[in-house]
């Protein structure tokens, strides 16, 4: 019997009946054995077939068999009810070998030409299975030339049998106080050949409770206890199970904080598995009773290990632990059934003693020393010398622990000095230079720093003076010795002030006339206002009406007197304002350069002379009484004049302050 080609030779070829294409002889038997490589099969088809037809092909036939299985017995030319001819059919081996047998009997009624067939090896697609057959692979099947391989979905691993997918279902640890776990793919059938381990691990003090829910279906056996697939539950105390079958197991109260669940499956079966809902319990803590003026959140029927509650106080109350204030309070239930922190108190908010008000005082309205929530206090400024700025002074203790004004401000009110107060009443007549009395010129400032000069207090920390008086100290403000509250130039009983900064008008040019002869000194501390130290007012817009020609102004200072010495006591003189053109004309003639008197100056004095300010008075204020407000304001600053003070036909020249209000206000607001 001729053998077909053997692998690894190319597996393809032609088979034909003996004598083909001529007729075949009687009593012939031919056998071909074709072998393909592993993973391949053989395909065979006929291009010519002409054999004697007989009942069940008993006489002449071609038989195709693969292993022990006969694939076909063929005869005739066309198929009948009981006989089969190949026609256009293609035949496939079941494995990698195909046997072809040709036989003719002892006679033929007429000549038959036999057959011609072609064969070839082709890849078997192992992944294609007939309906009703078990799939080649559990999950994914991949065909390739000469074979196939299986792979698994995420979460599975290929079993060593290379076909089954075992679940990667070990090492899951559940740490929440409750949860659910189930067999892989639940409620779909669980995977084969798998070993699953689940751990529930709660903090010490908790006890795990297991409830089987929904359905339970694990492969079982009528006689042997769970021989195929099983579920076991292990704690540090005992083991529960194995469980299998279709009945939901009862609740398991483990009395343990750690549980290990093991689920093992074999290679067969089609069951949906199981689902467990677990909860936990612990020793409850005492029910928290909220402190007065507080409430507990969240409200629960009971509180066990790890449960917590917070205390929130009503508006106007704050949390206190002992004497210490708390931003928040949360207590946690411990494993021994006690809370980790003692209950705090909700204590009424205490704003504490109110801050002292500089130049003012505070009065308790609600009650003496009462500083708790909703308590009211009233600030007021020291009468006569101070007034409260844009505030009614009423403050309430609010829930945030701050004293708060009716406008919602938490800062203190401001006591502003009252300006322009004087003990002096002005008369209509002009008197000669006179000694000032206490309280007459409480704004008067003595400036020592190389020379003797003067200034006027503005607010409680500024001094208005002449630029020429402090020009030398503009870069060394600390060199200025500033004294106030005294009438005597040489008295040790003065209030000392020190300069923080000197601001000279940018339009002033030293030794080139006296235009813009104005400067401000910022004091490094506020001075205390009293009857001897009071600021002068700045002129209102309407002030010009009190500074017309012949209106009386008052100049004061310790400058040179008629005797040619600096005055020991503060002196003052009442002098009328001089017509501007008249004054300009007075200083047009030599030795004065043209244009000495500018629009930024005003002049005052007597045509006959004798009443004037002099050297040492520089920077002092020429003041006027505002009859509407009954307050004194600064109209001029002692600036310059004739070489001989009080000379007839010459006048004292003063910086016109009203022209500089924006400059003054800008400096003070900026610094």
């Amino acid at each position: 019997t001729p053998l077909g080609p053997k692998w690894p030779e190319p597996v393809f070829g032609r088979l034909a009946s003996p004598g083909f294409p001529g007729e075949y002889a009687n009593d012939q038997e031919r056998r071909w054995t074709l072998t393909a490589p592993p993973g391949y099969r053989l395909r065979l088809y006929f291009t010519h077939f002409d054999l004697e037809l007989s009942h069940l092909c008993e006489y002449d036939f071609v038989k195709l068999s693969s292993g022990a299985k006969v694939l076909a017995t063929l005869c005739g030319q066309e198929s009948t009810d009981t006989e089969r001819a190949p026609g256009k059919d293609t035949f496939y081996s079941l494995g990698s070998s195909l046997d072809i047998t040709f036989r003719s009997d002892y006679s033929n009624e007429k000549p038959f030409t036999g057959f011609e067939a072609f064969y070839a090896a082709e890849d078997i697609d192992e992944c294609q299975v007939a309906p009703g057959e078990a799939p080649t692979c559990d999950h994914h099947c991949h065909n390739h030339l000469g074979g196939f391989y299986c792979s698994c979905r995420a979460g599975y691993v290929l079993h060593r049998n290379k076909r089954t997918c075992s679940a990667l279902c070990s090492g899951q640890v559940f740490t929440q106080r409750s949860g659910e776990l189930s067999s892989p793919e639940y409620p779909r059938p669980y995977p084969k050949l798998s070993s699953c381990t689940y751990s529930i691990s709660l903090e010490e003090g908790f006890s795990v409770i297991l409830d089987f829910v929904e359905s339970f279906d694990v492969e079982t056996h009528p006689e042997t206890l769970c021989p195929y697939d099983f579920l076991k539950i292990q704690t540090d105390r005992e083991e529960h199970g194995p469980f299998c079958g279709k009945t939901l197991p009862h609740r398991i109260e483990t009395k343990s904080n750690t549980v290990t669940i093991t689920f093992v499956t074999d290679e067969s079966g089609d069951h949906t598995g199981w689902k467990i809902h677990y909860t936990s319990t612990a020793q409850p803590c005492p029910y928290p009773m909220a402190p007065p003026n507080g409430h507990v959140s969240p409200v629960q029927a009971k509180y066990i290990l790890k449960d917590s509650f917070s205390i929130f106080c009503e508006t106007g109350y704050e949390l206190l632990q002992g004497h210490l204030p708390l931003k928040s309070f949360t207590a946690v239930c411990q494993k021994d059934g006690s809370w980790d922190r003692p209950m705090p108190a909700c204590s009424i908010v205490d704003c504490g003693p109110p801050d002292d008000l500089p130049s003012g005082r505070v009065e308790y309205i609600t009650g003496p020393g009462v500083t708790t929530y909703k308590a009211v206090i009233q600030y007021s400024c020291e009468e006569t010398f101070y007034t409260m700025k844009v505030n009614d002074g009423k403050y309430v203790c609010e829930a945030d622990g701050f004293w708060t004004s009716s406008k919602g401000e938490k800062s203190l009110p401001v006591c502003e000095p009252v300006c322009g107060l004087s003990a002096r009443t002005t008369g209509g007549r002009i008197y000669g230079g006179q000694k000032a009395k206490p309280g007459d010129f409480p704004w008067q400032v003595l400036i020592l720093g190389g020379t003797t000069a003067a200034g006027a207090l503005l607010y409680d920390n500024w001094v208005l003076t002449a630029a020429h008086a402090v020009y030398e100290q503009k870069h060394d403000a600390s060199a200025l010795d500033i004294r106030m509250g005294t009438l005597k130039r040489l008295s040790p009983h003065y209030t000392q002030a020190w300069s923080e900064a000197v601001f000279i008008h940018e339009g002033y040019t030293h030794d080139a006339g006296f235009d813009n002869d104005i400067a401000l000194i910022k004091l490094n501390n506020k001075v205390v206002i009293n009857s001897n130290i009071t600021p002068i007012c700045l002129p209102r817009k309407e002030a010009e009406s009190f500074m017309r020609t012949d209106d009386i102004g008052t100049a004061s200072g310790w400058g040179l007197t008629q005797r040619g010495f600096l005055a020991r006591n503060l002196m003052y003189v009442d002098i009328p304002i001089v017509d501007h053109q008249k004054c300009t004309a007075a200083y047009e003639k030599p030795p004065y350069p043209r244009g000495s008197v500018t629009a930024n100056m005003l002049c005052a004095g007597l045509e006959s002379g004798g009443k004037d300010s002099c050297r040492g008075d520089s920077g002092g204020a020429l003041v006027f009484l505002d009859s509407e407000t009954e307050r004194w304001f600064v109209g001029g600053i002692v600036s310059w004049g004739s070489m001989n003070c009080g000379e007839a036909g010459q006048y004292g020249v003063y910086t016109k302050v009203i022209n500089y209000i924006p400059w003054i206000e800008n400096i003070i607001s900026d610094f």
């Epitope: 010795d481 005597k488 040489l490 008295s491 040790p492 009983h493 003065y494 000392q496 020190w498 020991r568």
Partner: antibody
Framework: QVQLQQPGAELVRPGSSVKLSCKAS????????MHWVRQRPIQGLEWIGD????????YYNQKFKDKATLTVDKSSSTAYMHLSSLTSEDSAVYYC??????????????WGTGTTVTVSS | QIVLTQSPVIMSASPGEKVTITCSAS?????MYWYQQKPGSSPRLLIY???NLASGVPVRFSGSGSGTSNSLTISRMEAEDAATYYC?????????FGAGTKLELK
């Protein structure tokens, strides 16, 4: 030269009073403030008060307000301090001192010789 | 009132040695003044306005400081410098003195 002359000692009975003098020479008396300072045995210096001789303007340390009275006699260029209701606590050396007028006016450039007051029965 | 605390209360120094006496004020002062007093004599002005030397005072004496901390320094101690030294202020009413530092010759 500038001098402030004081009597060396005064012995007085408890409850009585004493008037201490300080005679100035060598300068214009009315141009300088006159101060008085107490020094008790083994203790520091305490300022009592001062007076302007030109117009008798006076300032006292509150501690001595009811104890001391300051006056001047311009004609004799003498300053006085009257101490009343004396007790052993008032036993001390009492100095007059001239106030400086060149700078801050708040210190003493010339000191008197001091009078030792002993209050004893 | 402003309290002036002098330190040390008592000290001794050898001739030629540098000596420093400090005066601490309970609140800031503008100027400090220093006086020397020898037994049986009246006080004598040494330093005015913190650092200025009074007339007739040897240049080995100097003053320095500001605010609440001031000091008197003798650059080289001499036998005639053995005395009690007082600091004084009048930035705040009433005028006050320190309790004194007794300097002895070693």
């Amino acid at each position: 030269q500038v001098q402030l002359q004081q009597p060396g000692a005064e012995l007085v009975r408890p409850g009585s009073s004493v008037k201490l003098s300080c005679k100035a020479s060598g300068y214009t008396f009315t141009n300088y403030w006159m101060h008085w300072v107490r020094q008790r045995p083994i203790q520091g210096l305490e300022w009592i008060g001062d007076i302007d001789p030109s117009d008798s303007e006076i300032y006292y340390n509150q501690k001595f307000k009811d104890k001391a009275t300051l006056t001047v006699d311009k004609s004799s260029s003498t300053a006085y301090m009257h101490l009343s209701s004396l007790t052993s606590e008032d036993s001390a050396v009492y100095y007059c001192a001239r106030g400086d007028i060149t700078t801050t006016l708040r210190y003493f450039d010339v000191w008197g010789t001091g009078t030792t007051v002993t209050v004893s029965s | 009132q402003i309290v002036l605390t002098q330190s040390p209360v008592i000290m001794s120094a050898s001739p030629g040695e540098k000596v420093t006496i400090t005066c601490s004020a309970s609140s800031s002062v503008s100027y400090m003044y220093w006086y020397q007093q020898k037994p049986g004599s009246s006080p004598r002005l040494l330093i005015y306005d913190t650092s200025n030397l009074a007339s007739g005072v040897p240049v080995r004496f100097s003053g320095s400081g500001s605010g609440t901390s001031n000091s008197l320094t003798i650059s080289r101690m001499e036998a005639e410098d053995a005395a009690t030294y007082y600091c004084q202020q009048w930035s705040s009413y009433p005028l006050t003195f320190g309790a004194g530092t007794k300097l002895e010759l070693k």
